[in-house]
C-alpha cells in the first residue's frame, strides 16, 4: 500500500526524503515470521521483549519466558527446546563472518522456572541446537561437537581433532559457509533426533588470508583466515553421523563420497535427513557443473551408511554451472524415497519436478517460460512453491499451491489477487503439515504479514501491517518507481526506474545506474524500499535504474548461463545498452549520467567505467573485485572455470579492472573499500589503486579502517554522506 | 589404484599367536566396512569377522569368537587381525576385504591377494 | 545364520557352451545376492551384485537372476578364461555367508 498521491494544494505539507530519514531508518518496515512449534502454535517475542506462545485455534496465547528472565541474562535470542521442558537464552552475541557468530548459552528449565545449575556450557560456543525431538542438546565448542542427554548432564565429545583455522566439525570453515552451505552450522539432527551428521572440514594445506586490524592498540592484529582464492587448495570434506543414543558404542561413521565424485576435488553441498535412517547427501564436482545426490541407508547389522548407486542421481549441466546460485536442495514426499527438486527443464528454464527412480524419468511438475523459485512444503495432499510466473514479472514472487493427491494434478495461486496492488513479492512460513502458514508481503506497496488456514487458504488475521509506517509516509513525498522492459537482440532487459515525485518527461534528469549485475542474481524486484536511492529521486532530483542484464536470474538458462567462463563482459554491455535506451527516452541529460555498486556491483561498475563509452561522467565502486584471481574458489570457479592454462586463465587475466587503468582518465571515479573486508578482500582495491597510479590516472578513494565488506555502524553514515557529496558536485548539484 | 595387501601370515604352533595387517590404497578407507575372509586347503570360502568404517563396531564368526580380534587405525589406512590361540582348523589364505554399500545391499568388491596362515607343530 | 546351498558342485563344459549355476537360500533374502568368480591361487572377483547387476569392467557373457531364495548364475558362451570356481554370497543379513562353490572345468 503505497500513500496514495497529493493533489496539488497538499503538496506543500508535502515533504522530501532527507538523506538523515534514510541514515536513522526513520521508514524501515517490519515482518513477522512465526517461530512455529506445531501445527497451530508459533512463538513470538512481543514488542516488551516476553516470548509468548499463540494457540491458532483456541485463540489463546501466553507468556512462556518473561522479558524479566530474558534480561536477567541480557539474551538476545532464545530457542525452546521440542519436549517444551527447557528454552535456551543466548548473550553475548558477537559476529564473526556473515552468518557465523559465537554466543553464552543458558538453559532455562521451564517445569522449577530455574536455570539449569552444574554441567553448564562452556563459553562462548560456536552453535547450539536442539534435537527435533526431546531436548538432546547438541553444540560446538573450539572447533569441536559435543552433546548433551539431557541439560543437566555432563557432556559427551563426539570430535577431538577441532583446531581454530584447521579442522572445523560441525561448522563450516569461511568458504563453506560463505558460498556453498550459507549457514554458521554443519550439523543435522535426523527427524526424531537419534543421528547427528556432521561436517568436517580440513583446511590444514588452504592458503591462509592475512590483514590488520588496527584496534585501539599500539601494535595492529593479523587476522588470518583459510581462504581458498580461484585455483588455490581447497577444504577437504568429510561427513560422518553418530548414533545420539548410544554415542560411545561405535562412534561417528564415515559417509562414502560417490565414486564419480570422489574421483577428483569435491565438494559437499547440503544434507537432507529423510527419515532417522534414511539420509541424503549432495556432492558437487570442483568444476561445478556436475552434482551427485546420494540417497544413504543405515545398515543396522553393520553399523555403517550404505549409498547405493541406484540411489544417485546426477545432475549435470551441459551449457553452464549446476543449479542457479546453489544447486537446489530436494524435498522428500511421504514414501521417503521419492522426491521433488527444482533443476532446468528441456526449454532451460528452472522448474519443479518429481523424481522417483531416476533424474532421466523424472516427471515436470511445473513448466512454462518462467521459473520456479522455491519448495516451501510438500504434504500428503500438496506441494506449496514459489515463482514468477504471474503476469510475467520475472521481478514478482506468487505462492502457488499444487494438489498432489488428485490428478491431473490442480494449481492453485494462494496470493495472486490477495492484495494485488500492494502485494506482488511473497514469502511464506508453514506450519507442521501446513496445517496452517504466514505470508510474508515484500512490497511493492507497504510490506504486511497475514495468517493463514492451510486447508482452505482463508486469511486468519493480520500479523503486522506496518501501520505506523504508513502513517509516517502520508506526509513524504515518494518517488515513483516503474518496473518495464527493453527489448534488444532478441534478450529481454528488464528495469526499475525511481522517479522524481513531480517527474516531467519533457524535463531532462541526471542518471544514476545502479547495478549489482551478479550471476544469479535479481535487482529488479516488487518490493517496497526506501532507501538512499530513494531519496536520491525524492530529494536530489536524479533518476535511478536498475538494470538486469546477462548473468542474472529467474528468467532461463539462456540469461543465466550467458555470462558462463566469461564474467565482466555481457553483464557490462547490458548496463551500456540500457544506458543508450534511457537516453533515448529524452528525459536523461547525457552529460550527467554516473553508476555505482557494491561488491560485484563495484566490479560491474568499474568495467563501465573503464568501457570508454563517454556515457559516464562519474562512478562509484564500492567494496569491488577487481580480479577473480582474488575471489575466493567456490564462487569464482563456478561461474569461470579455473585459472590455468588448458581452461580459462586467459579471461581471468582479461577481465580484471586493474588492465583497464587507462579508461579512468576521463571519469570521475571513487573507489571505496574497508580494510578488514574478509569477503572481498581489500587487495582487490590496492591492486586498482596501484594500477590508477602507475598509469597517473586521478581518483578519489575513501578506506574504512577495521571494517568488513558490510561497512556497518557509523561507517555506513559516513559512506552514504560521502557519496551523496560526490555525485552532487559530479551532477552539479548545490548542497 | 585401489588395492588392498596383506601381511603378517605364516607357520605358528597350535595356541600360538599371529597378527594379519591389511594395507589399503585408492580410497577412502575410513568410509568403508572391512571383513576377513578365510579359504582352507582345497575348500571354499568362509567369512571370519567383520569391522565397521569408524571400526567402533566387530563382529566374528562362532569359530573363532574369543580367539580373534579385529580391528583398525583410518590414520594408518590399515586393518589387522589378531589371531590367539590357534588351532590347526585355522589353517587357510586369509583375505581382507572392503565391503562397499554403493552395491544394493552391499557387496565385497575389492579383494587382497591373501596372506598364509599355517598352524601346525 | 543364513545358509546357502549351490548347485551343481561342479560341472564340466567346453568353450561357447551356456553354462547356468543355481544357489538357494534357506531363507528369503530379497534381491541381496552376489557371485563371485575364484581361480586358483588368485582372490576371489566380485562379477555380479544385487542378484542382477553386471560390476562394471565383467564381460557382458555373465548374466545374473532371481529373488527371494532361487537365484541363477548363467555364463551364456563360456570363454577359456572363465574356467573357475564360482561362489554366490548372501548380503542381507549379517553375518555374510557363501556358497560352498561350482567349480566349472574343461570337458
Known amino acids: 500500500l503505497r500513500p496514495s498521491r497529493v493533489h496539488n494544494s497538499e503538496e506543500n505539507t508535502m515533504r522530501a526524503l532527507t538523506l538523515k530519514d534514510i541514515l536513522n531508518g526513520t521508514f524501515s518496515y517490519k515482518t513477522f515470521f512465526p517461530n512455529w512449534i506445531s501445527g497451530q502454535e508459533y512463538l513470538h517475542q512481543s514488542a516488551d521483549n516476553n516470548i509468548v506462545l499463540y494457540n491458532i485455534e483456541t485463540g489463546q496465547s501466553y507468556t512462556i519466558l518473561s522479558n524479566r528472565t530474558m534480561k536477567s541474562v541480557n539474551a538476545s535470542n532464545y530457542g525452546l527446546s521440542p519436549d517444551r521442558q527447557f528454552v535456551y537464552l543466548e548473550s553475548d552475541y558477537s559476529k564473526l563472518w556473515r552468518y557465523s557468530y559465537t554466543a553464552t548459552y543458558y538453559i532455562y528449565d521451564l517445569s522449577n522456572g530455574e536455570f539449569v545449575r552444574g554441567n553448564e556450557l562452556p563459553r562462548p560456543i560456536q552453535y547450539l541446537c536442539w534435537s527435533p525431538v526431546g531436548s538432546k542438546l547438541a553444540y560446538v565448542y573450539q572447533n569441536n561437537i559435543y552433546l548433551k542427554q539431557r541439560p543437566g548432564d555432563p557432556p559427551f565429545q563426539i570430535t577431538f581433532n577441532g583446531r581454530e583455522n584447521k579442522i572445523f566439525n560441525g561448522i563450516p570453515d569461511w568458504v563453506y559457509e560463505e558460498e556453498m552451505l550459507a549457514t554458521k552450522y554443519a550439523l543435522w539432527w535426523s527427524p526424531n533426533g537419534k543421528f547427528l551428521a556432521y561436517a568436517e572440514f580440513n583446511d590444514t594445506d588452504i592458503p591462509v588470508i592475512a590483514y590488520s586490524y588496527y584496534g585501539d592498540e599500539q601494535y595492529p592484529r593479523t587476522i588470518n583466515i583459510p581462504y581458498p582464492k580461484a585455483g588455490a587448495k581447497n577444504p577437504v570434506v568429510r561427513i560422518f553421523i553418530i548414533d545420539t543414543t548410544y554415542p560411545a558404542y561405535v562412534g561417528p561413521q564415515e559417509v562414502p563420497v560417490p565414486a564419480m565424485i570422489a574421483s577428483s576435488d569435491y565438494y559437499f553441498s547440503w544434507l537432507t535427513w529423510v527419515t532417522d535412517e534414511r539420509v541424503c547427501l549432495q556432492w558437487l564436482k570442483r568444476v561445478q557443473n556436475v552434482s551427485v545426490l546420494s540417497i544413504c541407508d543405515f545398515r543396522e547389522d553393520w553399523q555403517t551408511w550404505d549409498c547405493p548407486k541406484t540411489q544417485e542421481h546426477i545432475e549435470e549441466s551441459r551449457t553452464g554451472w549446476a543449479g542457479g546460485f546453489f544447486v537446489s536442495t530436494p524435498v522428500f514426499s511421504y514414501d521417503a524415497i521419492s522426491y521433488y527438486k527444482i533443476f532446468s527443464d528441456k526449454d532451460g528454464y528452472k522448474h519443479i519436478h518429481y523424481i522417483k527412480d531416476t533424474v532421466e524419468n523424472a516427471i515436470q511438475i511445473t513448466s512454462g517460460k518462467w521459473e520456479a523459485i522455491n519448495i516451501f512444503r510438500v504434504t500428503q495432499d500438496s506441494l506449496f512453491y514459489s515463482s514468477n510466473e504471474f503476469e510475467e514479472y520475472p521481478g514478482r514472487r506468487n505462492i502457488y499451491r499444487i494438489s498432489i493427491g488428485s490428478y491431473p494434478p490442480s494449481k492453485k495461486c494462494v496470493t495472486c489477487h490477495l492484495r494485488k496492488e500492494r502485494c506482488q513479492y511473497y514469502t511464506a512460513s508453514f506450519s507442521d503439515y501446513a496445517k496452517y502458514y504466514a505470508l510474508v508481503c515484500y512490497g511493492p506497496g507497504i510490506p504486511i504479514s497475514t495468517l493463514h488456514d492451510g486447508r482452505t487458504d482463508q486469511e486468519i488475521k493480520i500479523l503486522e501491517e506496518n501501520k505506523e509506517l504508513e502513517n509516517a509516509l502520508k506526509n513524504i513525498q515518494l518517488p515513483k518507481e516503474e518496473i518495464k522492459k527493453l527489448e534488444v537482440d532478441e534478450i529481454t532487459l528488464w528495469y526499475k526506474m525511481i522517479l522524481p515525485p513531480q517527474f516531467d518527461r519533457s524535463k531532462k534528469y541526471p542518471l544514476l545506474i545502479q547495478v549489482y549485475g551478479g550471476p544469479c542474481s535479481q535487482s529488479v524486484r516488487s518490493v517496497f524500499a526506501v532507501n538512499w536511492i530513494s531519496y536520491l529521486a525524492s530529494k536530489e532530483g536524479m533518476v535511478i535504474a536498475l538494470v538486469d542484464g546477462r548473468g542474472t536470474a529467474f528468467q532461463g538458462d539462456k540469461l543465466l548461463y550467458a555470462v558462463y567462463r566469461k564474467l565482466g563482459v555481457y553483464e557490462v554491455e547490458d548496463q551500456i545498452t540500457a544506458v543508450r535506451k534511457f537516453i533515448e527516452m529524452g528525459f536523461i541529460d547525457e552529460k550527467r549520467i554516473a553508476i555505482w555498486g557494491w561488491s560485484y556491483g563495484g566490479y560491474v561498475s568499474s568495467l563501465a567505467l573503464a568501457s570508454g563509452t563517454g556515457l559516464f561522467k562519474c562512478g562509484i565502486a564500492v567494496a569491488p573485485v577487481s580480479s577473480w584471481e582474488y575471489y575466493a574458489s567456490v564462487y569464482t570457479e563456478r561461474f569461470m572455470g579455473l585459472p590455468t592454462k588448458d581452461d580459462n586463465l586467459e579471461h581471468y587475466k582479461n577481465s580484471t579492472v586493474m588492465a583497464r587503468a587507462e579508461y579512468f582518465r576521463n571519469v570521475d571515479y571513487l573507489l571505496i573499500h574497508g580494510t578488514a573486508d574478509d569477503n572481498v578482500h581489500f587487495q582487490n582495491s590496492a591492486q586498482i589503486a596501484k594500477a590508477l597510479v602507475n598509469a597517473q590516472v586521478d581518483f578519489q578513494a575513501m578506506w574504512y579502517s577495521d571494517q568488513n565488506h558490510g561497512l556497518s555502524g557509523l561507517s555506513t553514515n559516513h559512506l552514504y554522506t560521502h557519496m551523496t557529496h560526490f555525485l552532487k558536485q559530479c551532477f552539479s548539484l548545490s548542497d | 589404484e585401489v588395492q588392498l595387501v596383506e601381511s603378517g601370515g605364516g607357520l605358528v604352533q597350535p595356541g600360538g599367536s599371529l597378527r594379519l595387517s591389511c594395507a589399503a590404497s585408492?580410497?577412502?578407507?575410513?568410509?568403508?566396512?572391512m571383513i576377513w575372509v578365510r579359504q582352507a586347503p582345497g575348500k571354499g570360502l568362509e567369512w571370519v569377522s567383520a569391522?565397521?568404517?569408524?571400526?567402533?563396531?566387530?563382529f566374528n564368526a562362532d569359530s573363532v569368537k574369543g580367539r580373534f580380534t579385529m580391528s583398525r587405525d583410518n590414520s594408518k589406512n590399515t586393518l589387522y587381525l589378531q589371531m590367539n590361540s590357534l588351532r590347526a582348523e585355522d589353517t587357510a589364505v586369509y583375505y581382507c576385504?572392503?565391503?562397499?554399500?554403493?552395491?544394493?545391499?552391499?557387496?565385497?568388491?575389492?579383494w587382497g591377494q591373501g596372506t598364509l596362515v599355517t598352524v601346525s607343530s | 545364520d543364513i545358509q546357502m546351498t549351490q548347485s551343481p558342485s561342479s560341472l564340466s563344459a567346453s568353450v561357447g557352451d551356456r553354462v547356468t549355476i543355481t544357489c538357494r537360500a534357506s531363507?528369503?533374502?530379497?534381491?541381496?545376492l552376489n557371485w563371485y568368480q575364484q581361480k586358483p591361487g588368485k582372490a576371489p572377483k566380485l562379477l555380479i551384485y544385487?542378484?542382477?547387476s553386471l560390476q562394471s569392467g565383467v564381460p557382458s557373457r555373465f548374466s545374473g537372476s532371481g529373488s527371494g531364495t532361487d537365484f541363477t548364475l548363467t555364463i551364456s558362451s563360456l570363454q577359456p578364461e572363465d574356467f573357475a570356481t564360482y561362489y554366490c554370497?548372501?548380503?542381507?543379513?549379517?553375518?555374510?555367508?557363501f556358497g560352498q562353490g561350482t567349480k566349472v572345468e574343461i570337458k
Open positions: 531363507q528369503s533374502i530379497s534381491s541381496y
Open positions: 585408492g580410497f577412502t578407507f575410513s568410509s568403508y566396512a
Open positions: 554370497q548372501q548380503s542381507y543379513s549379517t553375518p555374510p555367508t
Open positions: 569391522i565397521s568404517g569408524s571400526g567402533g563396531y566387530t
Open positions: 544385487a542378484a542382477s
Open positions: 576385504a572392503k565391503r562397499d554399500g554403493g552395491y544394493e545391499g552391499g557387496a565385497f568388491d575389492i
